[in-house]
Structures are given as C-alpha cells and as structure tokens.
C-alpha cells in the first residue's frame, strides 16, 4: 500500500480467482484513543472499533472511503483505491490502446518546436468518475523539472456505438535548451483513477522524436506568364523555432488532381517557394519537416489551382 | 578551416557536408517502425558519448560570441563517431556491403572533421570503448543505437553550420 495523495491510498493486488488479497491496517488520524468506530462509504454498518482497523482487501467491494467516527463526529477519512496486477502485468483498462506507432501506446505526445513545450493526449470510453494527474521530468535518476498543467477533455468522438473521449495536457520543460542535443529523455507519468480503480501510464521520448511542425502559412500561387506553371510560395509557421537560419525546415510540394487515383506530382525543396504545373481542378499542398532530423511531417496546407 | 582560437571554418563547405551527413545517417538507419531502443541505466552506467550540451556554445548567440567552443565539441563528436564506425561494431559480422550508407557516412565524418581541424593540431578526443561484444546480434543492436545517437548529433551540427553559413560567413 502506498499514498497517492493526502488520505488517498493505493492497494496493489495480484488479481486472480481466490487470490488472498492484501492485509491493510488503517489508523485514525486523531489524538483520541477510545470510542472510535469505522464505516465504509455511505453505509452506517460499523466495521470495527478502535484507533486502527485491519481489513483484508481482495476486491473492489473492499475499496472505498473508510471513515473513523467518535460520537457521531467524523475524525478522518482514508480512501482506498485498487491497482490490479494480472499475470504480472498492471491493468490498463481505463485508457484505449492507440496502437500508433506501436501496440500498447496509451499516451501520444507531440511538440510544435524545440522550445521544450509539448502536448500529450490519450483516449478513453469512460465518461464519468474519472480523474487524471500528470507528472513529467527530464531523466529519471536525477530528474530535471517539467511543469504540466491539468488534463482537460479536448474532444469527443462517436466510434460505432461507442463514444470516445480524448484528454490532453500541456507540459513545459522548466529550463529548456532548444539548441542542445538531448541525451536524457522526457518522462511523462499519468495517474488515472476511475471510481475505485487506479492505473498508471508512462511515456518516454526525446523532444526531437515528437516534433511535428504546424503547416506552412500564407500559401500563395503566382501564375507565370505564358505558361501552365505557377510559382507557389509559403512561409514558416509562426510556432516554429527561431532563427530559421538555425532551425531550418524542408518542404514537400504536391500537386493533386480532383480524383485520388490521379498521379501526384511531388517536389522537395529547402526553399520557401517552388515552381509547379497547375492542372485544372487540381490543388497544391505543402507540408514541412525538420530539415536535419526526420521527425513527423506537418499536416498539409492546401490551395486550389483555379 | 577552424584553427583553434584563429580563423573561421569554411562555413558553406561544412554546411553542405553536414547536411549530407544527416541524409546518410537516416539512410543508414531509417526509423524501422518505432524501435524501442530506450536506454536503461543501472548502477554502472557511464555515458562517454560526446553530446552537444547547453553550455557548449552551439546556440545562435553562443556561435556569434565565439564559435570555437562549439566547433571543438563538434569536432570531438565527429572523431568519436568516425572511430566507432570504423570499429568492429560496424566491421564485424553481420557484414555491411562496401557501398552501404555506413561506409559513406564513415568517410563523410572523416571529411568534415578534417575541414574543421588542420593537420598538426589536435583537440582532445574521447576514447572509444575497448571491450567489444562477441555476438553478431549484439553488434547489430549497438549499430542501431549508435546510428540513432549519430542522427541527433549531426542534426545539431548541421544547424550550427547552416546558421554559420547564413550569418557568420565572411
């Protein structure tokens, strides 16, 4: 058993049929010695008396808020949550496996630049009685500070018969060094509590590996005289690290016909303009990627040819 | 050439070669799925790899103030990785093809380090480990890990030379 926060405790249980469970001793936080009784949740049934209560925790029915009283007055509370371990593996019932980029990916994170700011998100089908708490650090043995905000519900989607809820959190490295080569990864730890079930999820990454620039901005076309060619120009996204002579991007320019089956013409360039042939009913799209490190491409910025 | 405490490097040449290094490092080890190559430290973990750290002056301001500190650190890393790519980790079984990106990468690391340091002057360099793994798959795993680290190192070096070529070239 360990303390998650004040008066909230997590009991780690090996979860299998007829498992013996864990013996837990609760102590009433009071100077009083006599006349103390214990109850669980809203029930008025007295579970025991005395300053300590010993219970055998085997299932969710044994978890909940234990309260010690004296003469009708509440003295203190202890909330017991369960953390299930099945076949040596901690349960992952609360969050959905996003399966990208690999199986057992529960947390996904992205950064728009090298400032040390990043966003993580996760999915669940649970709509109520759900709380999250997020902690992060750079490295684990001698951790350097990363500050995370509160997790918030950022999207709701309908998937077949189910509703899916996306939660996200923003974190910022306290002493970020955008120009340095990272040698220690960022660690993100999410505590999830659904009713009386506790689970924890972790992710470890380098900012450089989760970089995904915003799409290029101000995408414009300039027709060239007496030609089917156009000059496409764009600018670095506002959210990208500066100076651009140091934090450079490379770009992919694509001409795509109305039909998805039509052949796509692609040009790669380090410049912020390119000359392409604009076909009727086609559209021109541009996306960006770090020039020197192959992290994710941005989403496309697009304009119609006409 | 970057004579320590002296003249500037050939920024544009360094920029071109460092950008080529980035391309080669990624073609030598493209991201295979999402390989879990996390390092698990234990009580004896010592990191002898020269990383470009915050205080090395490789940020835009540090380069403007005095690029020598940064160039020295980059040179140190280039020599370290050049020695690694020439060691039995890469030359032992399983054999690499003679024209593999690793062979070109090895040559380009040497080329860039020579652009940075003239003959006759030696900056301090890190030693590569002496105790080498005996099994081919151990070498294969280390190749992946070394190339992943090299990708990160050359990305920072390429940013330095790109910025230098754009802002510090005579």
């Amino acid at each position: 058993i360990w303390e998650l926060k004040k008066d909230v405790y997590v009991v780690e249980l090996d979860w299998y049929p007829d498992a013996p469970g864990e013996m837990v001793v609760l102590t009433c936080d009071t100077p009083e010695e006599d006349g103390i009784t214990w109850t669980l949740d809203q029930s008025s049934e007295v579970l025991g008396s005395g300053k300590t209560l010993t219970i055998q925790v085997k299932e969710f029915g044994d978890a909940g808020q234990y309260t010690c009283h004296k003469g009708g007055e509440v003295l203190s509370h202890s909330l017991l949550l369960l953390h299930k371990k099945e076949d040596g593996i901690w349960s992952t019932d609360i969050l959905k496996d996003q399966k990208e980029p690999k199986n057992k990916t529960f947390l996904r994170c992205e950064a728009k630049n090298y400032s040390g700011r990043f966003t993580c998100w996760w999915l669940t089908t649970i709509s109520t009685d759900l709380t999250f708490s997020v902690k992060s650090s750079r490295g684990s043995s001698d951790p350097q500070g990363v500050t995370c905000g509160a997790a918030t519900l950022s999207a709701e989607r309908v998937r077949g018969d189910n509703k899916e809820y996306e939660y996200s959190v923003e974190c910022q490295e306290d002493s970020a060094c955008p120009a340095a080569e990272e040698s220690l990864p960022i660690e993100v730890m999410v505590d999830a509590v659904h009713k009386l079930k506790y689970e924890n999820y972790t992710s470890s990454f380098f900012i450089r590996d989760i970089i995904k620039p915003d799409p290029p901005k101000n995408l414009q076309l300039k027709p060239l005289k007496n030609s089917r060619q156009v000059e496409v120009s764009w600018e670095y996204p506002d959210t990208w690290s500066t100076p651009h002579s140091y934090f450079s991007l490379t770009f992919c320019v694509q001409v795509q016909g109305k039909s998805k089956r039509e052949k796509k013409d692609r040009v790669f360039t380090d410049k912020t303009s390119a000359t392409v042939i604009c076909r009727k009913n086609a559209s021109i799209s541009v996306r960006a990627q770090d020039r020197y490190y192959s992290s994710s491409w941005s989403e496309w910025a697009s304009v119609p040819c006409s | 050439r970057a004579v320590p405490g002296g003249s500037s490097p050939a920024w544009t040449q360094c920029q071109q070669l460092s950008q080529k290094l980035c391309t080669l490092a990624w073609s030598a080890h493209p991201l295979v799925g999402h390989m879990d190559l996390r390092e698990e430290g234990d009580e004896e973990t010592t990191n002898d790899v020269p990383h470009i750290q915050c205080g090395d002056g490789c940020d835009p301001q540090g380069l403007r103030d005095n690029s020598q500190f940064c160039l020295q650190r980059i040179h140190q890393g280039l020599i370290f990785y050049e020695k690694l790519l020439g060691s039995d980790i890469f030359t032992g079984e399983p054999s690499l093809l003679p024209d593999s990106p690793v062979a070109q990468l090895h040559a380009s690391l040497l080329g860039l380090s020579q652009l940075l340091q003239p003959e006759g002057h030696h900056w301090e360099t890190q030693q590569i480990p002496s105790l080498s793994p005996s099994q081919p798959w151990q070498r294969l795993l280390l190749r992946f890990k070394i190339l992943r680290s090299l990708q990160a190192f050359v990305a920072v070096a390429a940013r330095v030379f790109a910025h230098g070529a754009a802002t510090l070239s005579p």
Partner: antibody, heavy 127, light 108 residues
C-alpha cells in the same frame, strides 16, 4: 521491480511438444536478450538458446537445433520456448533468464550473463 | 564448444573459512566473458560475478573473481552460513554459452 513470471508445471508424453511462457513485467523487453536454460534433476545448467525480441531472431545451441523454437511477443512482453519430440531425458526445470546490460560507450547492450531469472517451470516427460 | 571444468566437485569448509573455486576452459575465453552464479536448492541461479571480476549488483564484497584466458577463480574470503550452495561458472565468449558442472560448497 522487474520480474520474469513463467507458466506452470507440465507433464508430457514422449514424442509430444511443450510450450513454456515467460512474461516480463517492468523494464524494457524489446532490446533485452531472453535466454532459456534448463536443469535436469540433480544436474548442472544447460543453455538452450535465446532471442532479442526487437529483432525476432533466435539463436540456439547446436544440441537443440531443429527441436527447440524460441519466440517473443513484444506487445505482451512475453517470450516462449517450445520443445518438440520430447524424450524422458528432457525432464528438467526450464528457466527463462534476462541478460545483464553491458555498456559500450554510452549505449547499453545485453551481455550473455543472466542477472534476472524466472522461477522455473518443471517439465516432466513420462509415458 | 568451449568445455568448462570446475574443481573441486565438492568443497567442505566451515563458516569463516576462505573458499577458492576453480574454473578451467578448454580454450581461451576472449575479453574475459566469464560469469559465476550461486544456486541454492529449489531456487533459480543468482549472478555473482561477470566479466570475470566485476561483482553484480547487491553482491557482498567477500565474493571476488579473478583470472583470464583459460583459468578463472571465484574466491569467498570468509564464508557466511548463507554462502553454502552450488557455484557455476559460465562462458559467453562463443555460442553455445556453456556452464561448468558446478562446485558444491558444503558445511564441514
């Protein structure tokens, strides 16, 4: 802490096959080397083979080549050892073991020395 | 295959005495890829020494390893009651990774 948890004891008939599992909890599974070592009653230790899950490629002791198959499932952090054409002399405790990490420069790699062992699975081959 | 021969097969000593266990290889073990394990009845082996002379995590200082090439030694400077067990050497220089037949250290 990291643990290797093996499947339960098995009783098999000669000529049949047995598949023993080894589940890792905690730590990085993918780039570790998981070996299988057996110990016949009152006898010494015998290395059978091992796998590095990230590559999916196993290597085997010549003695067991063709009879043993070692596999790994990265998604469940589980390694498996299947031994076929069982004979009475295959009666033994079968251990899975994880390699100690060595250092090369700043990079860890698995040595072939085993610092973490499963609890063992007794396989009895008897008609 | 590299054959490892351990001697003696059994060592009868009293607590507090010094134990010296030998492991001889049929050919040179490169880079000192040699390990020592301790095994007690009904338990899995425990790694004591790797790289011939480095103590594994949590192993008491009374255990030390030495040697190179073909001759290796495990020394227990002063036997504690919990040290009475069987000790195996293992080479990981070449596949297959072979073990010695073991030395049993018993109470005299």
């Amino acid at each position: 802490q990291v643990q290797l948890v093996q499947s339960g004891a098995e009783v098999k008939k000669p000529g049949s096959s047995v598949k023993v599992s080894c589940k890792a909890s905690g730590g990085t599974f993918s780039s570790n080397y998981i070996s299988w070592v057996r110990q016949a009653p009152g006898q010494g230790l015998e290395w059978m083979g091992g796998i590095i899950p990230i590559f999916g490629h196993a290597n085997y002791a010549q003695k067991f080549q063709g009879r043993v198959t070692i596999t790994a499932d990265e998604s469940t952090s589980t390694a498996y050892m299947e031994l076929s054409s069982l004979r009475s002399e295959d009666t033994a405790v079968y251990y899975c073991a994880r390699s100690k990490k060595g250092m090369y420069g700043g990079w860890t790699y698995p040595l072939m020395m085993f610092d973490l062992w499963g609890q063992g699975t007794l396989v009895t081959v008897s008609s | 295959d590299i054959v490892l021969t351990q001697s003696p097969a059994t060592l009868s000593l009293s607590p507090g005495e010094r134990a010296t266990l030998s492991c001889r290889a049929s050919q040179s073990v490169s880079s000192n890829y040699l390990a020592w394990y301790q095994q007690k009845p009904g338990q899995a082996p425990r790694l004591l020494i790797y790289y011939a002379s480095r103590r594994a995590t949590g192993v008491p200082a009374r255990f030390s390893g030495s040697g190179s090439g073909t001759d290796f030694t495990l020394t227990i400077s002063s036997l504690e009651p919990e040290d009475f067990a069987t000790y195996y050497c293992q080479q990981t220089s070449n596949t297959p990774f072979t073990f010695g037949q073991g030395t049993k250290v018993e109470i005299k």
